[in-house]
Interface confidence: low
């Protein structure tokens, strides 16, 4: 907390300009009017304030706007945005794409910070849905931003926006997020032919159900192991050895190297050892010969 002290004679700021960089922290507190700062925020970014001085300026804005800054101030925060906490940002109501772009520019080249994640969260909630313009803007700054959104937030993405998503945008998505995105992608790409469809849908397959994987296995898609390893375990488990062999095509040999990793390891444990042996890969851990294989999904439905 900066101590309240009277502004020295002749030091009262008439405007936000370079002379303020020579002010001590207590002088900034005493001599800069918060309302003046708010109306001239666009100048702050052009002045080489120290981080300590920026702390004082932030403190003044916090006092002026205890309920959260107006968008007119937010749009011109510049480097002061880096001083904001997620708690500060949760008080904002950001609706302009230009405001969002201005703040993302400040953080450009860095990892997505908690502040940026919160900002995007506030923006999407304000907009009501993640439209294509927003999606294009955000993917330009953060390839992985989609995966920072909750499944609930992703549900607001219209299928038409899926065309803006690139494979690298989905790298860090978890299965719950892909569960939401996959049906949208399926809808978006439904009119494409087989091979083109697979190229587009491939990145989203971590959300695909068993029946869709079975269908793909009949289309000679030759799924690579990297894609297979990202599939939902529960979707892979019901696939037969023959179906996995068709799905992977020449990549089936890669199962050996991944036999201890999900979903391969869990799939192996649910297959008959006799069936696994037909692959000739030396996969071990299948159900011993003579053991009854229960259909677990049927068992659960009956219980």
């Amino acid at each position: 907390e900066v101590e309240k002290t009277a502004c020295p004679s002749g030091k009262k700021a008439r405007e936000i300009d370079e002379s303020l960089i020579f002010y001590k922290k207590w002088e900034l507190e005493a001599c800069v009017d918060a309302a003046l700062l708010a109306t001239q925020m666009d100048r702050v970014n052009a002045i080489p304030f120290t981080y300590e001085q920026l702390d004082v300026l932030k403190h003044k804005l916090d006092e002026l706007y205890p309920q959260g800054y107006p968008e007119s101030v937010i749009q011109h925060l510049g480097y002061l945005f880096l001083k904001m906490s997620p708690e500060d940002i949760r008080k904002w109501n950001v609706t302009s794409l230009e405001t969002l772009k201005a703040l993302l520019e400040v953080n450009k080249g860095h990892e997505m910070s908690p502040q940026v994640a919160t900002l995007i969260d506030r923006f999407v909630k304000g907009r009501g849905q993640l439209d294509k313009d927003t999606l294009d803007t955000l993917t330009a700054f953060y390839p992985g931003y989609l995966c920072s959104l909750s499944p609930e937030e992703l549900s607001s993405v219209p299928p038409s926006s899926i065309w803006a998503v690139r494979p690298q945008d989905l790298d860090t998505c978890d299965p719950r997020q892909l569960d939401v995105l996959y049906p949208k992608a399926r809808l978006a790409f439904q009119n494409m032919n087989g091979s083109e469809y697979f190229v587009k849908i491939q990145s989203f397959l971590g959300g695909a159900p068993t029946e869709d994987l079975k269908a793909l296995s009949q289309q000679n898609v030759s799924m690579d192991l990297a894609t297979f390893m990202k599939l939902r375990t529960d979707a892979v488990l019901p696939l037969t050895v023959a179906e996995v062999q068709k799905l992977l095509g020449p990549h089936v040999e890669g199962l050996k190297a991944e036999e201890r990793h999900r979903p391969v390891r869990d799939w192996i444990l649910r297959q008959r050892q006799d069936d696994l042996d037909t692959l000739g890969l030396g996969l071990q851990g299948g159900i011993p010969n003579g053991y009854l294989v229960l259909d677990l999904s049927m068992q659960e439905a009956l219980s």
Epitope: R260, R265, R270, G286, Y291
Partner: antibody, heavy 117, light 110 residues
């Protein structure tokens, strides 16, 4: 004949470190998953960690994550367990073992680690 | 507290059969067929006697057999002999590359 010989056990202070080593022979070490299993005095067995054939993946029981590191040198047929920030509850006989699909088929004779001040 | 539950002790007379149970959940024993059993004599390292629920490694007598029903695995030792007196541990794959062990059962040959 298969041999797994552990070394490096002994007395350590709480918060201290120890490095266990295991020399393997008599089987194809480089094509085997390897593991460390421990047994506290008078208690049951507890899996500690395992490591993939080429060393690219390692897995740990929750209680040692961030403190223990399993590693291997296939050129020397050796397995190691670096134990940092040791606690009294880490006191146990540590067995070097071969992990065949979540079964331990080969065991060493074990090395005793005592954590006490 | 062990992840898999075994009775602390079991006993039988020479020539008899004894069964040791190992209870888990649908996430370990019930979910996979990677149950193993180990025999450990005092002061010795454990020895694998059953893997893959019911498979015996070479050299293990056929007096030892394994089975599984739902979330419980069982080890049966028939034709009990004095040399069978030892601690027995079950293990199961528990998901996420974890190997879970039972607390152990002390088998006494009366």
């Amino acid at each position: 004949e298969v041999h797994l010989v552990e070394s490096g056990g002994g007395l350590a202070q709480p918060g201290g470190s120890l490095r266990l080593s295991c020399a393997a022979s008599g089987f194809s070490f480089s094509s085997s998953w390897m593991a460390w299993v421990r047994q506290a005095p008078g208690k049951g067995l507890e899996w500690v960690a395992n490591i993939k054939q080429d060393g690219s993946s390692q897995y740990y029981v929750d209680s040692v994550k961030g403190r223990f590191t399993i590693s291997r040198d296939n050129a020397k047929n050796s397995l190691s367990l670096q134990m940092n920030s040791l606690r009294a509850e880490d006191t146990a006989v540590y067995y070097c073992a071969r992990d065949i699909w979540y079964s331990i088929d080969y065991w060493g004779q074990g090395t005793l680690v005592t954590v006490s001040s | 507290q062990s992840a898999l539950t075994q009775p602390p002790s079991a006993s039988g007379s020479p020539g008899q059969s004894v069964t040791i149970s190992c209870t888990g959940t649908s996430s370990d024993i019930g979910g996979y067929n990677s149950v193993s059993w180990y025999q450990q004599h005092p002061g010795k390292a454990p020895k694998l006697i059953i893997y893959g629920v019911s498979r015996r490694p070479s050299g293990v007598p056929d007096r030892f057999s394994g089975s599984k029903s739902a979330n419980t695995a069982s080890l049966t030792v028939s034709g009990l002999q004095a040399v069978d007196e030892a601690d027995y541990y079950c293990s199961s794959y528990g998901g996420s590359n974890n190997l879970l062990f039972g607390g152990g059962t002390k088998l006494t040959v009366l």
